[in-house]
């Protein structure tokens, strides 16, 4: 069992982990989520991304998620078990990244340029909120996230 | 071999209760969620209920919340299903399912056990 | 709460092509399943993640999903495929997994 995002593969993450870990906060994030009209991970950054794109667009937005919404959020929280959860979430999130090499090649340009844009699509969003805002929601978002990389998850 | 075996259906009237139990083995239950799925006769699939491995998180159909109790015995292997207050309307074979992602892949199903609510 | 629509009946020839479709509001975005179930026996997954097969699913057994529609295309359907088929998508606002309708494959 392992995901497959086109040609780099990920070994060691358990997809039933993350879930446990996100519904653990869920119902805290989405409360706290006052903007019910955006949506981050909206329907151009995550729909019909091919094989190809799909290790480029993963790197870029779960380096997102760790470097600028685990990382801030967890100087803003206290409570125990939501750091633990976000610690599970970020531990996987780590892993994930640290086996994916997408290609840097010449001629990977137009599909690295692809999932890029696609990666600005969500960022822009989130950048069109205040700090505390758009932490909140993109961590209500990691479900849709988890939804997504199913269809690069294989038996 | 992954093997999920459902027990406790039986006849029973409206407004009673039954719990049915599902005996998994063959792989590490507490590592994966579960999930109670019904069908009616002559109908289609309906998901019933979900619980997370470490049976922390559960969740229910609509119509079923509050009459229905899903929960699991991680050191017996073995899933239940706890129902009350039952309609005729409940009538149905109920599958247990293991979840291969967490959040509804049904790799494995058991063969079901049938509940019939009639006076 | 999330919708899914399947036709109630679908005809094929033998060894022609079948194919069952699925609709649900932006269902492209999520992990469509599939399940294919005989008479008094348990469902079993014939395809996931869209267009993945399980291991033992023959190849003729394939997926896609985009859009508004997922679809279950079985190329070459042979006698034996002639059953109950269920699309299947987990909807992560209502913490819930949604099944279709359930569409009758008849093979000719």
């Known amino acids: 069992q392992e995901f497959h995002f086109g040609p780099c593969q990920v070994k060691g993450v358990v997809p039933q982990k993350l879930w446990e870990a996100f519904w653990a906060v869920k119902d805290t994030m989405q409360a706290q989520d006052n903007i019910t009209s955006a949506r981050l991970l909206q329907q151009e950054v995550l729909q019909n991304v091919s094989d190809a794109e799909s290790c480029y667009l993963v790197h870029t937005l779960l380096e997102f998620y760790l470097k600028t919404v685990f990382k801030n959020y967890h100087n803003r929280t206290v409570e125990v078990r939501t750091l633990k959860s976000f610690s599970t979430l970020a531990n996987n999130f780590v892993l994930i990244v640290s086996q994916l090499q997408p290609s840097q090649e010449n001629e990977m340009f137009s599909i690295r340029d692809s999932a890029h844009r696609r990666f600005l699509l969500f960022r822009r969003a989130f950048k069109q909120l205040d700090v505390e805002a758009a932490l909140t929601k993109a961590l209500g978002e990691v479900d849709i996230l988890l939804t997504w990389m199913q269809k690069f998850y294989k038996l | 071999e992954v093997q999920l075996v459902e027990s406790g259906g039986a006849l029973v009237q409206p407004g009673g209760s039954l719990r049915l139990s599902c005996a998994a083995s063959g792989f590490t239950f507490d590592d994966y969620a579960m999930s109670w799925v019904r069908q009616a006769p002559g109908k289609g699939l309906e998901w019933v209920s979900h619980i997370s491995g470490n049976g922390h998180s559960t969740f229910y159909a609509e119509s079923m919340k509050g009459r229905f109790t899903i929960s699991r015995d991680n050191a017996k292997n073995t899933l239940y299903l706890q129902m009350n207050s039952l309609k005729s309307e409940d009538t149905a074979v109920y599958y247990c399912a293991k979840d291969d992602y967490g959040s509804g892949l049904y790799a494995y199903w058991g063969q079901g056990t049938q509940v019939t609510v009639s006076s | 709460s999330y919708e899914l629509t399947q036709s109630p009946s679908v005809s094929v020839a033998l060894r022609q092509t079948a194919k069952i479709t699925c609709g649900g509001d932006?269902?492209?975005?999520?992990?469509a399943q599939w399940y294919q179930q005989k008479p008094g026996q348990a469902p079993v997954l014939v395809i996931y993640?869209?267009?993945r097969r399980p291991s033992g699913i023959p190849e003729r057994f394939s997926g896609s999903n985009s859009g508004n529609t997922a679809t279950l295309t079985i190329s070459g359907a042979q006698a034996e495929d002639e059953a109950d088929y269920y699309c299947q998508v987990w909807d992560s606002s209502a913490n819930a997994a949604v099944f279709g309708g359930g569409t009758h494959l008849t093979v000719l």
């Open positions: 993640a869209d267009s």
């Open positions: 932006n269902i492209g975005s999520k992990s």
